[in-house]
């Protein structure tokens, strides 16, 4: 059996085995964001669809109020894409005129809130300066990596400006995690 | 065994276990695209290398005619990167002259075709406005996420303009999926 | 049990099973880079933090001198994000004056070095032309895909210009791999 040496007379188990199909997993998709209060110097968190369309949570991975709740300690692959869109005019002209164009940048952060640490931990950040030529611009920021999480940890996606998030299609803006 | 209570006298198996090494997996790499007919208002699909160089398919995951064929129901991680390259001149000038620059945008879509649904399902989309300053531009769009797929589903990668896809190197443009 | 048919009287094992928790895994995070000599026409390799903060290596996956060392043959998901930042002035003006702006592009390559092959193999490349409007720019390049690796293979991340890498935060620039 996997995780143990092959031996005809005995078996030495090094670690417990578990079925892949019962591992905590979630894929959340974008919904229209209702403006919520957030504290100064803190990026607002997105909320998500968790059961309609392509979205799902399974095997005790639950979603509630902006957070993915980690039901079991282990190594998780966590990912998100946020598609931003906005309107700008020629940046350099605005800069020359001394009026910085909004936004100067777009940022996505996947954040962990954990019981064993007093402050939120930024796991992943994608940040991009934006000074587009032309009136309408749109672009995605994608993030994904593996992290060791503890039972009870909470994950959220924060963005620099919630009003720039493209919430029109579930395939453009999403957030997911699965236990490896 | 994990996924069950520890009990000395019996074991209650909740889900079948399976070896990781026999799970369906594929990594496909770019090849030069031959222009193919595609329906109006539908992005053309890329075709792929499936056995030379870094490319492979294994454990009943097959590639045929632009499609990855899903041999077994389950949760899959699906990913793709498409590198685009093109030539543009100063966008704002072109816009002012009333001639929108081509392309206005570049888009990648990972699409699922399933027997049980008449329309293809867009699983993932990466879309970016392009109005580059300077004569030559190039950039990748990366996508990746987890989806529940059914045996017999087919996956493809569609792009907004096949002529802009960089097919020169297998590490620049690729498409893959694996059962979790 | 996984990888075998359920049968009350006998069990047919198709492949060895192994516990997920004992698979080789690593997530490395950025550190300040010390300029190192590298060969002409070869991109310099980044070095990484492997144990502090979010970084870890486990289950015989080791990091040494810019390389992740693969301890066991199998299929690995490999990923990296590099955030670049720099300063530029209006590109088109510079181009018109015949002085190409530096950088013309930013590139990340995940490279495999293997004993059985004399040349390094480029597994993944993300490359983007850069000619930003505005004085300060920053942006990430993300890569991730699955590859079949052999015990003893070494992985590294190369970049086109090490001086442009944002080393300020562990969530902005990172590199990881895990056995599937």
């Amino acid at each position: 059996l996997k995780g143990q040496e092959f031996a005809p007379s005995h078996q030495q188990v090094y670690a417990p085995l578990r079925a892949d199909g019962d591992k905590p997993r979630a894929h959340l998709t974008v919904v229209r964001q209702t403006p919520t209060q957030h504290f100064k110097n803190q990026f607002p968190a997105l909320h998500w669809e968790h059961e309609l369309g392509l979205a799902f949570t399974k095997n005790r991975m639950n979603y509630t109020n902006k957070f993915l709740l980690i039901p079991e300690s282990g190594d998780y692959f966590i990912y998100s894409q946020v598609t931003f869109r906005g309107m700008t005019s020629e940046c350099s002209e605005i800069r020359q005129a001394g009026r910085p164009n909004k936004p100067d940048s777009i940022t996505v952060v996947i954040t962990k809130v954990t019981d064993s640490y007093p402050e939120p931990t930024q796991l992943l950040m994608g940040t991009k300066s934006v000074c587009e030529v032309g009136s309408n611009w749109f672009q995605p920021i994608y993030l994904g990596a593996m992290f060791s999480l503890q039972e009870g940890d909470k994950l959220m996606v924060n963005v620099s400006d919630i009003s720039l998030v493209d919430y029109t299609k579930e395939d453009k803006t999403f957030f997911g995690a699965f236990l490896l | 065994l994990k996924g069950q209570e520890f009990a000395p006298s019996h074991q209650q198996v909740y889900a079948p276990l399976r070896a990781d090494g026999d799970k369906p997996r594929a990594h496909l790499t770019v090849v030069r695209q031959t222009p193919t007919q595609h329906f109006k208002n539908q992005f053309p699909a890329l075709h792929w290398e499936h056995e030379l160089g870094l490319a492979f398919t294994k454990n009943r995951m097959n590639y045929t005619n632009k499609f990855l064929l899903i041999p077994e129901s389950g949760d899959y991680f699906i990913y793709s990167q498409v590198t685009f390259r093109g030539m543009t001149s100063e966008c704002s000038e072109i816009r002012q002259a009333g001639r929108p620059n081509k392309p206005d945008s570049i888009t990648v879509v990972i699409t699922k075709v399933t027997d049980s649904y008449p329309e293809p399902t867009q699983l993932l989309m990466g879309t970016k406005s392009v109005c580059e300053v300077g004569s030559n531009w190039f950039q990748p769009i990366y996508l990746g996420a987890m989806f529940s797929l059914q045996e017999g589903d087919k996956l493809m990668v569609n792009v907004s303009d096949i002529s802009l896809v960089d097919y020169t190197k297998e590490d620049k443009t690729f498409f893959g999926a694996f059962l979790l | 049990l996984k990888g075998q048919e359920f049968a009350p009287s006998h069990q047919q094992v198709y492949a060895p099973l192994r516990a997920d928790g004992d698979k080789p895994r690593a997530h490395l995070t950025v550190v300040r880079q010390t300029p190192t000599q590298h060969f002409k026409n070869q991109f310099p390799a980044l070095h990484w933090e492997h144990e502090l903060g979010l970084a870890f290596t486990k289950n015989r996956m080791n990091y040494t001198n810019k390389f992740l060392l693969i301890p066991e043959s199998g299929d690995y998901f490999i990923y990296s994000q590099v955030t670049f930042r720099g300063m530029t002035s209006e590109c088109s003006e510079i181009r018109q004056a015949g002085r190409p702006n530096k950088p013309d592009s930013i590139t990340v390559v995940i490279t495999k070095v293997t004993d059985s092959y004399p040349e390094p193999t480029q597994l993944l490349m993300g490359t983007k032309s850069v000619c930003e409007v505005g004085s300060n720019w920053f942006q990430p390049i993300y890569l991730g895909a699955m590859f079949s690796l052999q015990e003893g293979d070494k992985l590294m991340v190369n970049v086109s210009d090490i001086s442009l890498v944002d080393y300020t935060k562990e969530d902005k620039t990172f590199f990881g791999a895990f056995l599937l």
């Epitope: 209060q37 504290f39 968190a45 639950n62 509630t64 109020n65 902006k66 957070f67 709740l69 809130v113 954990t114 019981d115 064993s116 640490y117 007093p118 402050e119 939120p120 009870g152 909470k154 | - | -």
Partner: antibody
Framework: QVQLQESGPGLVRPSQTLSLTCTVS????????MHWVRQRPGRGLEWMGR????????KYNPSLKSRVTITRDTSKNQVSLRLSSVTAADTAVYYC?????????WGQGSLVTVSS | DIQMTQSPSSLSASVGDRVTITCRAS?????MYWYQQKPGKAPKLLIY???NLASGVPSRFSGSGSGTDFTFTISSLQPEDIATYYC?????????FGQGTKVEIK
Amino acid sequence: QVQLQESGPGLVRPSQTLSLTCTVSGFDIDDTYMHWVRQRPGRGLEWMGRIDPASGHTKYNPSLKSRVTITRDTSKNQVSLRLSSVTAADTAVYYCVMSGGAPDVWGQGSLVTVSS
Amino acid sequence: DIQMTQSPSSLSASVGDRVTITCRASQGVMYMYWYQQKPGKAPKLLIYGASNLASGVPSRFSGSGSGTDFTFTISSLQPEDIATYYCQQWEGNPRTFGQGTKVEIK
């Protein structure tokens, strides 16, 4: 500014249930974890348990588990503590503590005396 | 339970002295926290994650250590530092505090 305010009766009869409420202002409790810690006279600090307000999941000190219940009301941004079957040994200052979503914030404490 | 053994239980030092308090966990922990409590007040977080200074805390306070052995240091004792100091581990269930170290001025 984040503030935590404990409230509840200062005197509880033996064998009765001690009930305290912690009201948080300036921060959404869903974004944190809320703990209760007590300090008996002349003694050190004792962690009683915590709740994740987002999910309602709780963890308790095993030494108190049979008697302690922590709940939350996210609409009021409040968490509550109930300690049943109290004795004189439960006389203490009870603190609610917010952590995880922001640097540790403690309430000022509520002295509860168990006496007949 | 993870037992936290703090020493000394009390100490007396002069203004400007370097003061060191140790805390030993009965098993390895990843994160250690240090609190200051003045009479009649709620504890205040000084150090988190073994060595990170909480916001607004003077730089004369520091923490170090890993695994089972942790140290809290006041590099130059000030009159306002008179208080009881507690270590706490936040990983095992239950969370446990050290018994406290009372710091006085000579």
